[in-house]
């Protein structure tokens, strides 16, 4: 083996040596039949036409042929990994789910971290949230934790997510990123002024996956076995210290090695450094959230330590590579939905949206089976129920048991005790605009009491330079709403985009083509 | 360091209104959320009612509908408008400013007036 080479350059090598007592195996067509020859089709004479009998072909070129499957729609390019969760605190008192036990209980988890808004093929090193979503394997079934890296969110209401995503996406006309759609509706949605900052602060470009905190961001619900419920967040802490890449490297690493956090990833859980994350909750009681001075199922918002301080869980712990990317990291499918008893969903509008959205997302990128799938199948619960049959249905399709419920014929009960925890609701029903639930505070003691002056001279540049792309008038709609934060965040960041503009003139007007018409009004004169 | 001074307190009728104000001796505009805490004779101290420094309000159930949070950041004031007093109402009532550093807002500063007694009695 190379000395010179890391364990994912030697991949290959690596597997070579670990069948090295081994005969290789008998190459097959799907169906498992041997093949004789795999390098030559199938003609009439030397230089004639292919034979539709030649299966050896077809098999191959068919299933090849249907290899891609939709990437995800978000969060496309990441990296996966497994390990362990260990209780190290007892938490019983808030939450009855099996996973929190008893101290030094094990749980297996699967874990994807992942970037937003590139395309599976794109750079690791790209200012953008990453995600960091953890699968437990539960006695109760798989509990997802969907989280980020940051402990917030661009908005707070979910029906703005596909114009959001839209935003950061490719323009549908040039497929090119474009600065207007991005800071004009930021700068339309000033509740994204925190995750903006927090973005492009220094922790906006993580070195690597293993070198960053994780949050489940939203609120949820912990209910003891008593049916005593409070508010939760969750929070996982880097053992390894938090990185981050300067504007410098990163730009270099997403040109010299843009799979950076996957190879990092790899190489390190291959040679033993298992990375880990200490595990955190806050809580917050039903009275507390009468009094705290924000919505506290604001998705925009996080709850201060120091009066919701972080208690301390357990460790999460990654000491396995995947076997096969595709398997068991592509087709992984996280969904904030899974959740076993003793944790429940807040009225966080954002969680409400994704409860719905993660699983209908993987309906369509995996198929309506996609638990069958080895990575998502809660392999640790017994699946009784009274779904059957679809596309793909991978198991024994609960054999002989009824495929209905009631029945007399002692198949699947249901459980008392996994009822959810009831609560009281009253109010009015209608759109709530959330537009102006107070978008600066918790910003302006982020840039006023959290950075320090050369950190905040950072943020400024990082975001004149994002920003000088956009039009004007776009830029104005942004600075104004820095300024509402603090005066210097809004000023420094003028001077800067001063300058910008100053070296490049920019045309004040926005022109497009009206939808609907494929030709601009002087072509169509010279029809 | 924020001194904190309250003024408009004094006795009233039930049914009554009075406008507490709260004056400080420095800029208000990043202090994270100020407050209006009451403490009644023999009782623990309360929370009436919070105002962030981009003005989201809440207010303790038993003053809802009838109690008003403002704060101007400009003037560094803030009012506690009291509307429709009850005798329950009576008390010490405290302005308070706390602000909040570190990521996770994980320490803060924290100020306090010296009080100022409302009394509502017929």
């Known amino acids: 083996m190379a000395d010179s080479r890391d364990p994912a350059s030697d991949q290959m090598q690596h597997w070579k040596e670990q069948r090295a007592a081994q005969k290789a195996d008998v190459l097959t067509t799907g169906a498992g039949n041997p093949v004789g020859d795999k390098l030559n089709v199938i003609t009439v004479g030397p230089r004639g036409p292919l034979l539709v009998q030649d299966v050896v072909f077809t098999d191959e070129m068919a299933h090849f042929d249907r290899e891609r499957i939709p990437e995800r729609v978000v969060h496309a390019k990441g990296a996966g990994a497994f390990g362990y969760f260990e209780v190290t605190h007892d938490i019983t008192k808030y939450s009855k789910a099996k996973v929190f036990e008893h101290i030094g209980k094990k749980t297996p988890i699967a874990v994807r971290f992942s970037t937003v808004a590139g395309e599976s093929g794109s750079a690791d090193t790209v200012r953008d949230p990453r995600g960091f979503a953890v699968k437990f394997y539960t006695e109760d079934g798989n509990w997802d934790l969907v989280g980020n890296n940051t402990p917030i969110f661009f908005i707070r209401d979910p029906i703005l997510f596909p114009s959001f995503i839209h935003s950061q996406k490719r323009n549908p006309q040039t497929h090119l990123k474009d600065p207007d759609m991005v800071w004009d509706f930021w700068s339309l949605r000033p509740e994204s002024l925190h995750q903006v900052s927090f973005l492009f602060s220094d922790r906006g470009i993580p070195d690597g996956h293993r070198h960053m905190n994780g949050y489940g961001s939203h609120t949820f619900k912990l209910v003891n076995a008593n049916g005593e419920a409070v508010y939760c967040k969750f929070h996982y802490k880097t053992d390894q210290g938090i990185k981050n890449l300067s504007v410098e490297d990163a730009a270099r690493l997403s040109q010299e090695d843009p799979d950076y956090g996957i190879r990092d990833l790899f190489n390190a859980i291959a040679t033993g450094k298992y990375p880990s994350w200490t595990f955190y909750i806050q809580v917050m009681t039903f009275n507390q959230a009468e009094t705290f001075p924000f919505n506290p199922f604001d998705l925009t918002k996080v709850w201060p330590h120091k009066d919701y301080p972080l208690i301390p869980v357990g460790k999460l712990v990654l000491n396995r590579n995947p076997v096969n990317y595709f398997a068991e990291v592509e087709q992984i499918a996280f969904d904030p939905s899974n959740m076993p008893p003793g944790i429940e969903a807040s009225p966080d509008k954002m969680l409400q949206g994704r409860l719905f959205a993660y699983p209908d997302t993987h309906r369509h990128r995996l198929g309506p089976n996609y638990l069958h799938i080895p990575v998502n199948c809660p392999y640790r619960a017994r699946v009784a129920n009274y779904q059957r049959d679809g596309p793909m249905c991978m198991q024994d399709n609960q054999g002989g048991a009824p495929n209905y419920y009631p029945n007399s014929f002692g198949a699947p009960e249901q459980q008392p005790s996994a009822l959810e925890h009831s609560i009281q609701y009253s109010g009015e029903v209608r759109r709530f605009n959330t537009a102006n639930d107070d978008n600066v505070t918790q910003v302006r003691a982020f840039y006023v009491n959290v950075l320090n002056e050369e950190q905040r001279k950072r943020l400024c540049e990082n975001i004149a330079g994002h920003l000088k792309d956009a039009q004007i008038f776009i830029q104005k709609k942004a600075v104004k709403n820095f300024t509402e934060v603090h005066p210097d965040y809004g000023s420094h960041i003028q001077a800067l985009l001063d300058k910008y503009n100053a070296e490049k003139p920019k045309n004040a007007i926005h022109t497009f083509v009206q939808s609907g018409s494929h030709l601009a009004a002087r072509e169509k004169a010279n029809l | 360091q924020v001194q904190l001074v309250e003024s408009g307190g004094g006795l009233v009728q039930p049914g009554g209104s009075l406008r507490l104000s709260c004056a400080a001796s420095?800029?208000?505009?990043?202090?994270?959320?100020m407050a209006w805490y009451r403490q009644a004779p023999g009782k623990q101290r309360e929370l009436v009612a919070t105002v962030t420094s981009g003005g989201a309000t809440n207010y303790a159930n038993s003053v809802k509908g009838r109690f008003t949070i403002s704060r101007d950041n400009a003037k560094n004031t803030m009012d506690l408008q009291m509307n429709s007093l009850k005798p329950e109402d009576t008390a010490v009532y405290y302005c308070?400013?706390?602000?909040?550093?570190?990521?996770?807002?994980?320490?803060?500063?924290?100020?306090w007036g010296q009080g100022t007694q409302v009394t509502v009695s017929s």
């Open positions: 308070n400013a706390e602000d909040y550093y570190d990521y996770g807002l994980s320490r803060s500063k924290i100020y």
């Open positions: 420095a800029s208000i505009f990043s202090i994270y959320v």
